[in-house]
């Protein structure tokens, strides 16, 4: 069960393992998400990461985890959150009110040096990743693939 209020919040820019920036652009009244190289002095978009503590026994969660996990939601602008669209294997920005749907929650992984990964709460084994200069949902089918660069991201305050 995920806590109602976040244990902490953190405003950061999000970039890929290869230092490309995740940017958000308003187009035709909806937001598009891009993965791109920024020019030297170009300002990076910030994302509000809200961290929630999730506590459950493994038999309840079905994911084999028998204790705490950190869940995170990502909001680049007020009232909009990243959502996992598992049907389309896509990552989208949706406007919504709290309480947020499960599709807006991602299990945080940060066991790989100083990078993080985001696993769909609604679809264990599926992670936010980079595909063709866009964010997409990527199925990670073996433990070794958890370290593949396309699902690793860096958080930075600058």
């Amino acid at each position: 069960i995920t806590g109602i209020s976040p244990i902490t919040e953190y405003l950061a820019s999000l970039s890929t393992y290869n230092d490309q920036s995740i940017t958000f652009a308003l187009e035709d009244e909806s937001y598009e998400i891009y993965v791109e190289d920024l020019k030297k002095d170009e300002k990076k978009d910030k994302v509000l990461l809200s961290y929630y503590e999730s506590q459950h026994p493994s038999n309840e969660s079905g994911d084999g985890v028998d204790g705490k996990m950190l869940m995170v939601t990502l909001s680049p602008t007020k009232d909009f959150w990243l959502h996992a669209n598992n049907k389309e294997h896509s990552v989208e920005l949706h406007k919504c009110e709290k309480p947020l749907p499960d599709q807006a929650f991602f299990v945080l992984h940060n066991m790989h040096s100083n990078c993080v990964s985001f696993e769909c709460k609604t679809d264990p084994g599926v992670f936010i990743g980079v595909k063709d200069n866009h964010l997409a949902l990527i199925k990670v089918d073996s433990s070794e693939n958890l370290c593949t660069e396309n699902i690793l991201f860096k958080l930075s305050e600058t």
Partner: antibody, heavy 122, light 107 residues
Framework: QVQLVQSGAEVKKPGASVKVSCKAS????????MHWVRQAPGQGLEWMGE????????SYAQKFQGRVTMTRDTSTSTVYMELSSLRSEDTAVYYC???????????????WGRGTLVTVSS | DIQMTQSPSSVSASVGDRVTITCRAS??????LAWYQQKPGKAPKLLIY???RLQSGVPSRFSGSGSGTDFTLTISSLQPEDFATYYC?????????FGGGTKVEIK
């Protein structure tokens, strides 16, 4: 219940290597990183590194880079820490320790082994 | 590496006293700070995580606060079993680093 059982005390000569084991039980082994922290007599805590049992990737403190190797055996839920080129300053209690949150070290370390005393003396 | 500076290095106090220990990070670590208690010959014990969250089973006389670079551990009314050494640890980035420790001794 969660348990981390470490191998017994070791006495080594300078220049030798030591390999300490840590057998985990009572939880899903591959869902949690395993850290190694050491404490020299009368001194503070020093983080050495972490192994991710899921894929075997490691992160080591710069100080130990090139001298430490962390490995794991998922079939026995055991992690190993090998430290080479031992010197007297490596005399310490070596702890294996598990974070309190799966997949993440952000929420601190809540499970510790009892420690393995490694004495380096000629 | 992020340096963690703890103060004081030792404090003498009596049962019932309020004890405050501070920890400063050399750069911002958000709220990713943990506090541990260690008694001689024993492994450390997690008291507080995420700067202010009380670990399950830890008495409520222990509390933590702070974010960014400055953090505090407070023991509101010191008990006989609280005489120990306390360490802060940043959990934000590798390498994880510990403060030098604060020994709480009987006055």
């Amino acid at each position: 219940q969660v348990q981390l059982v470490q191998s017994g005390a070791e006495v080594k000569k300078p220049g030798a290597s030591v390999k300490v084991s840590c057998k985990a039980s009572g939880y899903t082994f591959i869902s949690y990183g395993m850290h190694w922290v050491r404490q020299a007599p009368g001194q503070g805590l020093e983080w050495m590194g972490e192994i991710n049992p899921h894929g075997g990737s490691t992160s080591y403190a710069q100080k130990f880079q090139g001298r430490v190797t962390m490995t794991r055996d998922t079939s026995t839920s055991t992690v190993y820490m090998e430290l080479s080129s031992l010197r007297s300053e490596d005399t310490a209690v070596y702890y294996c320790a598990r974070p309190s949150a799966a997949y993440s070290h952000y929420l601190g370390i809540d499970m510790w082994g009892r420690g393995t005393l490694v004495t380096v003396s000629s | 590496d992020i340096q963690m500076t703890q103060s004081p290095s030792s404090v003498s106090a009596s049962v019932g006293d309020r004890v405050t220990i501070t920890c400063r990070a050399s750069q911002g670590i958000s709220s990713w700070l943990a506090w541990y208690q260690q008694k001689p010959g024993k492994a450390p014990k997690l008291l507080i995580y995420a700067a202010s969250r009380l670990q399950s089973g830890v008495p409520s006389r222990f509390s933590g606060s702070g974010s960014g670079t400055d953090f505090t551990l407070t023991i509101s009314s010191l008990q006989p079993e609280d005489f120990a050494t306390y360490y802060c640890q940043q959990a934000n980035v590798f390498p994880l680093t510990f403060g030098g420790g604060t020994k709480v001794e009987i006055k």
